[in-house]
């Protein structure tokens, strides 16, 4: 009889331990859920507030029509400049028209003065043709004014109100471009 009671007591104790473990797991799970909920709420809040305050261009970018432009504050070689733009979901500036060129050069005058800024223009080593980064040709009025004497790869840059060319491995500021967000209102 005593053995039977002792076995029952042990079984009850085992059950109690299991229940405590389950309670602990539940508490942990509840805490985890609360944390996730908090994270989700914060994420939603951020998304909503950014959507509410959404301007067509990110902070420190300049807007002109459907485009946003970023004028760098650091120097880099042409290839690194391209990668820096890609990190921001943009590409090096591709100038489509004289109007866009005028806007860019006018903005640069206001911001920084007469420095060199890489744009997304490079010269094909074989054919010598100038091409934008998407493979399109620049319009005749937007070809670099001087041919660089460099034996290395040659890339385009803006200075004052001119489009010029230089060895892609030289260090310059750069300009990134991306589409402006369309307002849903």
């Amino acid at each position: 009889k005593l053995l039977q009671v002792s076995t029952i007591a042990m079984q009850q104790q085992e059950k109690l331990i299991q229940q405590e473990r389950a309670l602990l797991n539940f508490t942990e799970w509840k805490r985890s859920c609360a944390l996730q909920m908090k994270y989700c709420q914060a994420f939603m809040q951020n998304s909503l507030s950014s959507a509410h305050n959404s301007s067509p261009c990110p902070n420190n970018w300049i807007q002109n029509r459907e485009s946003c432009y970023y004028v760098s504050e650091i120097w880099s070689i042409w290839h690194t400049s391209q990668e820096n733009c890609l990190k921001e979901g943009s590409t090096l500036l591709q100038i489509e028209s004289k109007e866009e060129m005028d806007f860019i050069t006018g903005s640069l005058r206001k911001i920084k003065g007469s420095y060199d800024y890489w744009v997304g223009l490079s010269q094909d080593g074989h054919s010598g043709r100038w091409l934008w980064q998407d493979g399109s040709s620049p319009s005749p009025g937007l070809l670099p004014a001087e041919r660089s004497q460099s034996a290395n790869q040659v890339c385009g840059y803006v200075k004052s109100n001119s489009l010029l060319s230089s060895n892609c491995s030289t260090w310059k500021y750069f300009i990134c471009e991306k589409y402006a967000l369309r307002s849903s209102v």
Partner: nanobody, 115 residues
Framework: QVQLQESGGGLVQPGGSLRLSCAAS????????MGWYRQAPGKQRELVAA???????TYADSVKGRFTISRDGAGNTVYLQMDNLRPEDTAVYYC?????????WGQGTQVTVSS
């Protein structure tokens, strides 16, 4: 963390075509652009093509007119259509995801152009 998985590499004859795919998983909302790089033996890794979230594309001079970068509607998978392949296109091709703070690389897929 972003994971990238490339596929589609292989052996092809000069003038032939291949289509590479790169599937992204993980924190894909942080990706701003995706690109393809390549590295030939004894050479530096170079950018071949890239595409931004907005759809803007960029290509290396050596592949303009031959290679086309694109992505699926969800933006999770990026493709590199390679036409008119040349022996000098032989390399390991790597997929790269650009975020503001960090760049993620795939393991690479071998492309060999030889007759």
């Amino acid at each position: 963390q972003v994971q990238l998985q490339e596929s589609g590499g292989g052996l092809v004859q000069p003038g032939g075509s291949l289509r590479l795919s790169c599937a992204a998983s993980g924190r894909i909302s942080s990706i701003n652009s995706m690109g393809w790089y390549r590295q030939a033996p004894g050479k530096q890794r170079e950018l071949v093509a890239a595409i931004t979230n907005g759809g803007a594309k960029t290509y290396a001079d050596s592949v303009k007119g031959r290679f086309t970068i694109s992505r699926d509607g969800a933006g999770n998978t990026v493709y590199l259509q390679m036409d008119n392949l040349r022996p000098e296109d032989t390399a390991v091709y790597y997929c790269k995801a650009f975020t503001r703070t960090y760049d993620y690389w795939g393991q690479g897929t071998q492309v060999t152009v030889s007759s």
